[in-house]
């Protein structure tokens, strides 16, 4: 089938005192092979500081996945979600505290 690029969505939620969990979700993509990871100051975080969801079908012929990590509140601007799919790549910032959703569709 033809390539379908992912929609990438970054959200944040309170984790504990002084910490937040940031989640990067990629959805609606095909084929299923994708790279999704968190970077700090442009450098990938270690594997054990990130939690990945499985790449699963969404029932519409495309796939979805996610990656999350916990960061210190106030350091959001240092973190980006890196996505690579079918030769295309992009980075996605953490939304500021008063905005909880960022959506980007990549072509």
């Amino acid at each position: 089938g033809s390539t379908v690029p992912p929609m990438v969505n970054v959200t944040r939620s309170e984790a504990s005192e002084g910490n937040i969990t940031v989640t990067c979700r990629a959805s609606g993509f095909y084929p299923w092979n994708i790279t999704l990871s968190w970077r700090q100051d442009g450098v990938s975080l270690s594997h054990d500081t990130q939690q990945w969801g499985d790449v699963l079908p969404d029932g519409n012929g495309t796939y979805q996945t996610w990656v999350a990590t916990r960061i210190c509140q106030g350091e959001e601007q240092r973190f980006t979600c890196y996505m690579e799919h079918s030769g295309n790549h992009s980075t996605h910032p953490v939304p500021s505290g008063n905005s909880h959703h960022h959506h980007h569709h990549h072509h």
């Epitope: 299923w32 499985d54 969404d58």
Partner: antibody, heavy 122, light 112 residues
Framework: QGQMQQSGAELVKPGASVKLSCKTS????????ISWLKQKPGQSLEWIAW????????SYNQKFRDKAQLTVDTSSRTAYMQLSSLTTEDSAIYYC???????????????WGRGTLVTVSA | DVLMTQTPLSLPVSLGDQASISCRSS???????????LEWYLQKPGQSPKLLIY???NRFSGVPDRFSGSGSGTDFTLKISRVEAEDLGVYYC?????????FGGGTKVEIK
């Protein structure tokens, strides 16, 4: 973990249809894959299908493709399964179960409803 | 369809014993995403099944550490290190890697 409240027992006639509901609370509905399963008394379980609440996309066991239809209503946080052209072979307990996609578990049926007994009898 | 075969059908135990249930799949059950969705459930009479183990060996939250899962390829095992009264019931293995997802026939763990 949240709740999954299934509708009450149904007694239906052969050839009729029935719509079962699974009302949820206590978790983000759209983040879940909701599956429906069938169990006849004293027997093992059969997976019927799943529906992803976030998009309404679904995947069916071919055996049940013409028997079951899954839908979700995000506004009421409810999943439905309609069973059609019922025969006595469809008499069973039907369970809904969920997989929280953004939770920590990679299990398909982490949380279950209590089941709905469907009896097909003339 | 992937056939899941459980043995034994019935497993009489004494409380405190170790119990072992085997599950064999008719083909390899590695998902295209490289995960193995082999799960174990316990169903007590009149209740819904409850998840014990997912992805072969991961204990679900709240499941006692006397339960352990292992295996690979087509052969999988659930072990209960010291059976307690609350462990009695029917155990099912399940594969969620290949559609249609399928369950084993069940193993009834009961008192000797």
């Amino acid at each position: 973990q949240g709740q999954m409240q299934q509708s009450g027992a149904e007694l239906v006639k052969p050839g009729a249809s029935v719509k079962l509901s699974c009302k949820t609370s206590g978790f983000t509905f759209s983040d879940n894959y909701i599956s429906w399963l069938k169990q006849k008394p004293g027997q093992s379980l059969e997976w019927i299908a799943w529906i992803y609440a976030g998009t309404g996309g679904s995947s069916y066991n071919q055996k049940f493709r013409d028997k079951a239809q899954l839908t979700v209503d995000t506004s009421s946080r409810t999943a439905y399964m309609q069973l059609s052209s019922l025969t006595t072979e469809d008499s069973a307990i039907y369970y809904c179960a969920r997989h929280d996609y953004y939770g920590t578990s990679g299990a398909w049926f982490a949380y279950w409803g209590r089941g709905t007994l469907v009896t097909v009898s003339a | 369809d992937v056939l899941m075969t459980q043995t034994p059908l019935s497993l009489p135990v004494s409380l405190g014993d170790q119990a072992s249930i085997s599950c064999r799949s008719s083909q390899h059950i590695v998902h295209s995403n490289e995960n193995t969705y082999l799960e174990w459930y316990l169903q007590k009479p009149g209740q819904s099944p409850k998840l014990l183990i997912y992805k072969v060996s991961n204990r679900f939250s709240g499941v006692p550490d006397r339960f352990s899962g292992s295996g690979s390829g087509t052969d999988f095992t659930l072990k209960i290190s010291r059976v307690e009264a609350e462990d009695l019931g029917v155990y099912y293995c399940f594969q969620g890697s290949h559609v249609p997802w399928t369950f084993g026939g069940g193993t009834k763990v009961e008192i000797k």
